[in-house]
């Protein structure tokens, strides 16, 4: 027999299957060109001195063999005596150590046995009822396939799985989805219903993230508020990177975890937009307002758990920057303007009350007045800061009020609302003899003293009822006592105290009469 032909004679070894565990297996035969065919197989066991024979039986019952020698792959043409148009049965017999080992048989029509392509192009990945669904377009003119997948994690070897038979222009596969680790998948195809057909190559890796994106483990710090009324939010610790399987390292589309920063500005609730979402890499500047910050991790399956922080408001106050004038029509605030066409947000809340009770007002964009000041006015009827109590005021500014990260703090200060002159009047003024020509005057602290920076000073007035002479004595806002000296015995005096702010003179307390008794010597 010629080596290129299938030999229709008895093979040159005895016909007896040893039934040993070793031997040829996994025979695959397919068409490799218009007129050529190839069969390949695996051999389990020691290969020294093994001769392989590819056996073939035609539908007529006639059988032949090709001698492959030590090779486990053999090619032949459509002229080799094997009927390619009709079904044939093929198997391998390996002669080794004076015994014959046989592979399982495959029955196929060689003509139609073409090697399939793996899934090509875009493999779409989605989540379906806790499983992974992969879908791809069937390679052209290869409808009708068996599909297998293999998958691995960073710490586990390949595991094989079955997608089942496919018979459409699109093919799909349901695969296991891991909760917390990334996976690499590969797919392969072979002709449906042809037991000896050859598997395609494995597809390119499909990299799949875990169902749950990793929780971000990050830490922030906030810088001091700068001269421009803004402070930088900085990331102290980058989020941990997801561990990837071998084939997904480097460029691994599909496994990316994106971290987004969600800012919620709690102060100034009357502004248009309270929240903004940014990429974590782009750390923003913030005003001195209070914020809630969340870092949200997400992958192609959606968002995961987030981490949240509260950034408290910067409470550094500027006691002199705000001027307030109270007139008959209402109240006007003045402060140094930031720039042209700025929108300001004025926020106030009673001191010692929950931050949720803050009230605010948004101005229309305004330019500085000739003195370089910005203003905000309100009428008494509006009720704004109308109660006689201490308010904490913060003013924010922005040229783009719709952009959350472009607000800056102009100033923070305290203001006593309502009729501060009257409300601030000191009560419980008392006079005690101190010496032969002096007295000690005491009073209860003014309500204004509860408002940091508002009370500029106390003024104590002493009036000589005989001569009608008046003397005034300034007293530090932290003091509630003064000694009046140089007084004459037997003279009637009245004493009054008032509390002044930077922009308002207080109302005198009720006059308190006293005199120093004349000392009679024995």
């Amino acid at each position: 027999c010629r080596t290129s032909e299938c030999c229709f004679q008895d093979p040159p070894y005895p016909d007896a299957d040893s039934g040993s565990a070793s031997g040829p297996r996994d025979l695959r035969c397919y068409r490799i060109s218009s007129d050529r065919y190839e069969c390949s197989w695996q051999y389990e066991g020691p290969t020294a001195g093994v001769s392989h024979f590819l056996r073939c039986c035609l539908s007529s019952g006639r059988c032949c063999y090709f001698a492959a020698g030590s090779a486990t792959r053999l090619q032949f043409s459509d002229q080799a005596g094997v009927s390619v148009l009709y079904t044939v049965t093929l198997w391998v017999e390996s002669w080794a150590r004076n015994q014959t080992e046989k592979s399982p048989e495959v029955t196929l029509q060689l003509y139609n046995s073409v090697k399939y392509e793996p899934p090509l192009g875009d493999i779409k990945v989605s989540k379906l009822a806790g499983q992974l669904r992969m879908e791809w377009e069937t390679p052209d003119n290869q409808v009708g396939a068996e599909v297998q997948f293999r998958h691995r994690t960073p710490s586990s070897p390949w595991k094989l799985g079955d997608c089942g038979p496919q018979d459409d222009d699109t093919e799909s596969c349901l695969c296991p989805l891991e909760m917390n680790v990334a996976q690499e998948f590969q797919l392969r195809r072979r002709q449906l219903g042809s037991q000896g057909s050859s598997w395609s190559k494995w597809s390119s890796p499909v990299c799949v993230p875990p169902e749950n994106p990793p929780q971000p483990q990050v830490r922030f710090s906030v810088e001091q508020l700068g001269q421009d009324g803004r402070r930088r939010l900085t990331l102290k610790e980058q989020p941990t990177q997801l561990e990837l399987p071998e084939g997904c390292q480097g460029l691994a589309p599909g496994t990316e975890v994106t971290y987004r920063l969600q800012l919620h500005m709690l102060s100034c609730p009357c502004k248009a937009k309270a929240t903004r979402t940014l990429h974590l890499g782009k750390m923003p500047y913030l005003s001195g307002a209070a914020y809630n910050v969340a870092v949200i991790s997400s992958n192609q399956f959606g968002p995961g758990l987030n981490q949240t922080w509260h950034i408290p408001a910067d409470t550094h106050t500027e006691p002199v920057a705000l001027n307030i004038s109270v007139g008959t029509n209402g109240t006007t605030m003045y402060w140094p303007a930031r720039a042209q066409s700025m929108t300001y947000c004025i926020e106030w809340q009673p001191v010692g009350q929950d931050g949720g009770l803050a009230t605010c007002s948004l101005t229309a964009p305004q330019d500085p007045d000739p003195a370089g000041m910005a203003t905000y006015s309100w009428s008494r009827e509006s009720g704004a800061m109308g109660q006689e109590k201490c308010y904490y005021i913060t003013i924010f500014a922005s040229a783009h009020p719709e952009k959350l990260t472009l607000w800056s703090t102009v100033l923070s200060t305290y203001h006593f609302g309502g009729n501060a002159s009257a409300a601030g009047t000191p009560h419980h003024v008392s006079v005690k003899n101190h010496s032969l020509d002096s007295v000690s005057v005491d009073w209860a602290p003014s309500l204004l003293s509860t408002c940091p920076g508002v009370l500029k000073e106390y003024v104590v007035r002493c009036r000589d009822e005989d001569s009608k002479q008046v003397s005034e004595h300034p007293v530090q806002p932290t003091e509630t006592q003064v000694t009046l000296s140089g007084l004459r015995a037997g003279v009637a005096y009245t004493v009054q105290v008032r509390a002044d702010t930077a922009w308002l003179r207080g109302v005198w307390s009720q006059p308190q009469r006293f005199s120093i008794e004349v000392q009679v010597s024995d």
Epitope: R31, S34, Q109, Y111, N112, V114, N141, Q142, V143, G144
Partner: nanobody
Framework: EVQLVESGGGLVQTGGSLRLSCAAS????????MGWFRQTPGKEREFVGE??????????ADSVKGRFTISRANAKNTITMYLQMHSLKSEDSAVYYC??????????????????WGQGTQVTVSS
């Protein structure tokens, strides 16, 4: 569904050449192979040749081997199969039909393996 339309038939001298085309449209990705058959009056359709579309593998009847060549061109949703005929003989005169199959079982030479057929185009070889 798949639609097949043949073109290119006509009258040609003995020894001449002719190229037939078959345009397939519709659900073309599901076709695995396309073939040419021919028929003369009063006789059964005779296999000429076939091409496996995904690989371009061809197979010919002995009567045309070496003279006829089948090729194909793929575009989006259409496939065109060609039959290039050289050294034509009078016995090549027939109506030539284009056929398509969607299954991998069966031999190419049997008409019953093909689900789709064209209307046919006449080829006349005159001496």
């Amino acid at each position: 569904e798949v639609q097949l339309v043949e073109s290119g038939g006509g009258l040609v001298q003995t020894g001449g050449s002719l190229r037939l085309s078959c345009a397939a449209s519709g659900r073309t990705p599901s076709i695995v192979a396309m073939g040419w058959f021919r028929q003369t009056p009063g006789k059964e359709r005779e296999f000429v040749g076939e091409i496996i579309l995904s690989k371009g593998f061809t197979y010919y009847a002995d009567s045309v081997k070496g003279r006829f060549t089948i090729s194909r061109a793929n575009a989006k949703n259409t496939i065109t199969m060609y039959l290039q005929m050289h050294s034509l003989k009078s016995e090549d005169s027939a109506v030539y039909y284009c056929a398509a199959r969607q299954n991998w079982s069966g031999g190419p030479t049997r008409t019953n393996e093909y689900e789709y057929w064209g209307q046919g185009t006449q080829v006349t070889v005159s001496s």
